[in-house]
């Protein structure tokens, strides 16, 4: 709390501008009117206030509005935003893409902080879902954003939203979240033709089904090692050599390098050592010629 | 470029004046706060003065306040500091710097002009 | 407020991890940076509001810390990191910087 004092003579502030730059915390509080101050935010992002002085303007501001700023301060609220408490803004109506635009403009270059989280899921929820542009604005700022939704949060995210997904904004995606994802992308892109639907659809592939696989197999999409390490371990396992092979086309010879890493290894030990020979890459722990393969869930379902 | 030159330095008996310049390039100089950063010989850092983007308003440390004022020129694009009453421990490098538009760290210092005082 | 900057000097190597911790008498948010001196030369900003990478600046530069103390992390020195690092708080007037902390080659 800053104790009230009486504004000196001549203090008083007529408008918010650089006269107050070196204003003592006590001659802000005194001279500077709350009222004057909302009305005039945007220019305190002109001037440069020490972060004490920072927390009394944010303080007359809080005395003004107890309830929450209104949007018309939100949207200018500038450097000021960086001193707002996640509590502060959880009173918030936050609309405008304008003014979430304006508040991330002010923390770029900062980890997302517990404010901004705050900030981003009061104006998701205010919108009842992830739209396009909401979305677009998310992922320029914070290309981590999408990975950061629980599979939950993710499935109220429109299949026209996927569009403005770009391959780096699913870097951290785990399985759960690309079993989300791609359904929608796969939706998303349907009517684009084969070699441009591979092209989208490739960073959402970790969380493709077996069968759309073995479809990606016979479209001659030469799938690179980067992309097929990420797939589904239980998407892979079925998928026979013939088909691995059509799947990544020059790049099946990456095999050798990945053997001992899942998917690969896990493959491997499905997949008969006959076959694997075909490949001519030395691929080692098939199943042996003349070994039977039996499939016990297959037995367990039909039991 | 974005640039800042400072001029003026040198040596002056303790008791007498200098006037200090420092030319800035390649940023629109009014919109901008400026100070003045000197460092004693083989010492740290010490924020001497500051004025505001206008020139209106200003601020001195306690060691140099009624001896030094700081001032603009927005058409020449200069900031200045008239140094009077010089003593032995004001020798030191003054650096020119540039602070963000909403903040006081600086992006952008001048290579500094060596004020010695001594008799 | 005074900032106390600790160690005054230490020596390293190249590829060493150096850390570089920054006290302030009394609590200034975040509102703390970091800058590089070189001999003969002007200060160079590494980190601004205690945490955010100054832009150009190698990522092997990293800042932390709130309140009262902070920390400049180099991961990796690297030979043209031999130089005399400050701190400096933007909290409240008047500005004032620590003492600095010399890194010399071991």
């Known amino acids: 709390e800053v104790e009230k004092t009486a504004c000196p003579s001549g203090k008083k502030a007529r408008e918010i501008d650089e006269s107050l730059i070196f204003y003592k915390k006590w001659e802000l509080e005194a001279c500077v009117d709350a009222a004057l101050l909302a009305t005039q935010m945007d220019r305190v992002n002109a001037i440069p206030f020490t972060y004490e002085q920072l927390d009394v303007l944010k303080h007359k501001l809080d005395e003004l509005y107890p309830q929450g700023y209104p949007e018309s301060v939100i949207q200018h609220l500038g450097y000021l935003f960086l001193k707002m408490s996640p509590e502060d803004i959880r009173k918030w109506n936050v609309t405008s893409l304008e003014t979430l635009k304006a508040l991330l403009e002010v923390n770029k270059g900062h980890e997302m902080s517990p404010q901004v989280a705050t900030l981003i899921d009061r104006f998701v929820k205010g919108r009842g879902q992830l739209d396009k542009d909401t979305l677009d604005t998310l992922t320029a700022f914070y290309p981590g954003y999408l990975c950061s939704l629980s599979p939950e949060e993710l499935s109220s995210v429109p299949p026209s939203s996927i569009w403005a997904v770009r391959p780096q904004d699913l870097d951290t995606c785990d399985p759960r979240q690309l079993d989300v994802l791609y359904p929608k992308a796969r939706l998303a892109f349907q009517n684009m033709n084969g070699s441009e639907y591979f092209v989208k659809i490739q960073s959402f592939l970790g969380g493709a089904p077996t069968e759309d696989l073995k479809a990606l197999s016979q479209q001659n999409v030469s799938m690179d090692l980067a992309t097929f390490m990420k797939l589904r371990t239980d998407a892979v396992l079925p998928l026979t050599v013939a088909e691995v092979q059509k799947l990544l086309g020059p790049h099946v010879e990456g095999l050798k390098a990945e053997e001992r890493h899942r998917p690969v290894r896990d493959w491997i030990l499905r997949q008969r050592q006959d076959d694997l020979d075909t490949l001519g890459l030395g691929l080692q722990g098939g199943i042996p010629n003349g070994y039977l393969v039996l499939d016990l869930s297959m037995q367990e379902a039909l039991s | 470029e974005v640039q800042l030159l400072e001029s003026g330095g040198g040596l002056v008996q303790p008791g007498g004046s200098l006037r200090l310049s420092c030319a800035a390039s390649g940023f629109t100089f009014s919109s901008y706060a400026m100070s003045w950063v000197r460092q004693a010989p083989g010492k740290g850092l010490e924020w001497v003065s500051a004025?505001?983007?206008?020139?209106?308003?200003?601020y001195y440390a306690d060691s140099v306040k009624g001896r030094f004022t700081i001032s603009r020129d927005n058409s020449k694009n200069t900031l200045y500091l008239q140094m009077n009453s010089l003593r032995a421990e004001d020798t030191a490098v003054y650096y020119c710097a540039k602070g963000r538009r909403f903040s006081w760290y600086f992006d952008l210092w001048g290579r500094g002009t060596l004020v010695t005082v001594s008799s | 407020i005074q900032l106390t900057q600790s160690p005054s000097s230490l020596s390293a190597s190249v590829g060493d991890r150096v850390t570089i911790t920054c006290r302030a008498s009394?609590?200034?948010?975040?509102?703390l940076a970091w800058y590089q001196q070189k001999p003969g030369k002007a200060p160079k900003l590494l980190i601004y509001?205690?945490?955010s990478l100054e832009s150009g600046v190698p990522s092997r530069f990293s800042g932390s810390g709130s309140g009262t103390d902070f920390t400049l992390t180099i991961s990796s020195l690297q030979p043209e990191d031999f130089a005399t690092y400050y701190c400096q708080q933007f909290n409240n007037y008047p500005l004032t910087f620590g003492g600095g902390t010399k890194v010399e080659i071991k």
């Open positions: 009394q609590g200034i948010s975040s509102a």
């Open positions: 509001d205690a945490s």
């Open positions: 004025i505001s983007g206008s020139g209106g308003s200003t």
